[in-house]
Interface confidence: low
């Protein structure tokens, strides 16, 4: 997180730390699902059980956390690893339910009315242990409040090289300051961009940290997030089809998706 | 020549009547007869919320037949109140006995509730009654447990710490 501040206990109780090949994040849904970015878990597709999932902690390196393991990972069938970040969304089913408390609480999915809290200039909050402006992964969970950016403005910002045309799709939303300085960054991938629903006084996930400019916090560039509201049917179908309850272990973890595997020779620079 | 005929012996006997069947508490006898003799039978039916028990074994039905020696071929069963047994534990919740401590018999009421703050009840209101079929049943007729679903979107940023 660039230009952010330290989170306090209970501020982001849905925050999940995912350690696999790299540091990434996710957000707890219900008590046995984690919402994350497809690119954050794609490299571990051959061994879902290798995902080390931690929650209930503020400190990235602390040994005091609630551990969870993956039972299955569902990558959106429309995500193609070496062709941009459209449909950059995945669900991890945990093999046990976690106990909910003030430090571990799920994030809400957006209601139909949620778009009214996610208009241009509305403030969302991104959190994570990713790179800070000092160039290191944060030891303490950090967060930053950033406004939603007009979609056309964001599309235009990424129309010029080195970004390929059409990088920003309708399945994405952008957030950040035109002057730069406040952004998510590498290592924050998969974490939730959350908004306050002022009617219910509950926080909901509007975006998933996906990608952005080569230099985080760059002026005239913005953080790009998967637009969660576009994927509510996909999320609900998977959760209903594959069950709410954790199986309590046993069996090998699996990856489930309907994509064609391609040789991932080209490695993106992404958050 | 005089004709010869054999002896004709006429036997007459009175069949032993079986003792009059007294219905067990919370049960009734059918059919009701003035007396029950050889090969007569009766069945016992329990009132709603009671079940037939022979010793500790539940019976689907009970019929006794009057024997030649004037005894019934089966001992009288009991009509015992249906017991739904201890209710299942509710994950992330608790159960309270409403009718009385540990009372789990017919028409007993229990109330499930979820752990405050972090869980909310889904499916029904959590009130279950012990029904005649031996199952705890909700007011909606469900025999499955309610669900304690985690409350989402709570944060110390809006509640000022919990």
């Amino acid at each position: 997180i660039y230009g952010g501040q330290k989170a306090k206990p209970g501020d982001f109780p849905w925050q999940v730390l995912i350690l696999g090949g790299t540091t990434a994040a996710g957000a707890l849904l219900y008590d046995n699902w984690v919402l994350t970015a497809a690119h954050a878990v794609y490299e571990q597709k051959h061994d879902a059980s290798a995902l080390d999932i931690r929650m209930g902690t503020l400190k990235r390196l602390s040994p005091h956390y609630t551990q969870a393991w993956s039972e299955a990972v569902f990558i959106h069938e429309g995500y193609t690893h070496d062709a941009g970040f459209d449909n950059d969304i995945a669900l991890i089913k945990l093999n046990n339910k976690v106990v909910i408390n003030s430090n571990i609480t799920p994030i809400c999915l957006p209601r139909k009315e949620a778009e009214s809290f996610m208009r241009t200039d509305d403030i969302g909050t991104a959190s994570g242990w990713g790179l800070t402006q000092r160039g290191f992964l944060a030891r303490n969970l950090m967060y930053v409040d950033i406004p939603i950016v007009d979609h056309q403005k964001c599309t235009a910002a990424y129309e010029k090289p080195p970004y390929p045309r059409g990088s920003v799709t309708a399945n994405m939303l952008c957030a950040g300051l035109e002057s730069g300085g406040k952004d998510s960054c590498r290592g924050d991938s998969g974490g939730a961009l959350v908004f306050l629903d002022s009617e219910t006084e509950r926080w909901f996930v509007g975006g998933i940290v996906s990608w952005g400019s080569m230099n985080c916090g760059e002026a005239g560039q913005y953080g790009v997030y998967t637009k969660v509201i576009n994927y509510i049917p996909w999320i609900e179908n998977i959760i209903s089809d594959f069950g709410g309850g954790g199986s309590g272990g046993g069996g090998s973890a699996k990856f489930v998706a309907a994509w064609t595997l391609k040789a991932a020779a080209h490695h993106h620079h992404h958050h | 020549m005089a004709s010869m005929t054999g002896w004709k012996i006429h036997y007459t006997s009175t069949a032993h009547a079986c003792p009059y069947p007294m219905a067990p508490p919370n049960g009734h006898v059918s059919p009701v007869q003035a007396k029950y003799i050889l090969k007569d039978s009766f069945s016992i039916f329990c009132e709603t919320g009671y079940e037939l028990l022979q010793g500790h074994l539940p019976l689907k039905s009970f019929t006794a037949v009057c024997q030649k020696d004037g005894s019934w071929d089966r001992p009288m069963p009991a009509c015992s109140i249906v017991d739904c047994g201890p209710p299942d534990d509710l994950p992330s919740g608790r159960v309270e006995y409403i009718t009385g401590p540990g009372v789990t018999t017919y028409k007993a009421v229990i109330q499930y509730s979820c752990e405050e703050t972090f869980y909310t009840m889904k499916v029904n209101d959590g009130k279950y009654v012990c029904e005649a079929d031996g199952f705890w049943t909700s007011s909606k007729g469900e025999k499955s447990l309610p669900v304690c679903e985690p409350v989402c979107g709570l944060s110390a940023r809006t509640t000022g710490g919990r």
């Epitope: 209930g56 390196l61 602390s62 040994p63 005091h64 956390y65 609630t66 551990q67 046990n96 339910k97 106990v99 309590g248 272990g249 046993g250 | -």
Partner: antibody
């Protein structure tokens, strides 16, 4: 390099007390839960007690509850085990260990990553 | 208490052989089993955590498997430094318990 050095062992009579210390170095002591584990030829390895990283909670095996007290001084990176009302069955080699935490289905769980060299405690008249 | 039974008590092998050591729990412990090696006159050393998860610095010839009640520690091509006692430990119950150990000795 992680180092755990126990001290304070020796011969003591039944009913008496003994205090063990464990000096830790090579890691951030106040980030780790700590434990004592003992070993005898007859009973093998036995977990004795655990203290959380900040000293807020302690856990004991049933046979030592009320007699043993585990404590820590984070400023000195030192772990202690105060053993009172000692019994002959407490005779063992006592190891100091770091314990990594894990929570599952609401239960506290752990394994022992680093161990000291051990200190011998003999309870005999 | 959860009882862990290790078998065999002693295993005689020659270097280069591959071996499997068994640990059986008296009730299901999910994957909450950890394996330790204790060389003669040394402290125990963590080899495998949570049934199959490797520990950095431990040679890759050590691997673990199993869940529920039956667990196995495998050593692929035993080396001379592997002749030790091996213990399993469960952390499913808050009263941690260890197995009695399997001694791996030179045939």
């Amino acid at each position: 390099e992680v180092q755990l050095v126990e001290s304070g062992g020796g011969l003591v009579q039944p009913g008496r007390s003994l205090s063990l210390s464990c000096a830790a170095s090579g890691f951030t002591f106040n980030d780790y839960n700590m434990a004592w584990v003992r070993q005898t030829p007859k009973k093998g390895l036995e977990w004795v007690a655990t203290i959380l990283f900040d000293g807020s909670r302690t856990y004991y095996r049933d046979s030592v509850k009320g007699r043993f007290t585990i404590s820590r001084e984070n400023a000195k990176s030192t772990l202690y085990l105060q053993m009172d009302s000692l019994r002959s069955e407490d005779t063992a080699t006592y190891y100091c260990s770091t314990e990594s935490p894990y929570y599952s289905e609401g239960y506290y769980q752990g394994y022992f990553d680093y161990w000291g060299q051990g200190v011998m405690v003999t309870v005999s008249s | 208490n959860i009882v862990l039974t290790q078998s065999p008590a002693t295993l005689s092998v020659t270097p280069g052989e591959s071996v499997s050591l068994s640990c059986r729990a008296s009730q299901s412990v999910s994957t909450s089993i950890h394996w330790y090696q204790q060389r003669s006159n040394e402290s125990p050393r963590l080899l495998i955590k949570y049934a199959s998860r490797s520990i950095s610095g431990i040679p890759s010839r050590f691997s673990g498997s199993g869940s529920g009640t039956d667990f196995t520690l495998s050593i692929n091509r035993v080396e001379s430094e592997d002749f030790s006692i091996y213990y399993c430990q469960q952390s499913y119950s808050s009263l941690y318990t260890f197995g009695a150990g399997t001694k791996l000795e030179l045939r």
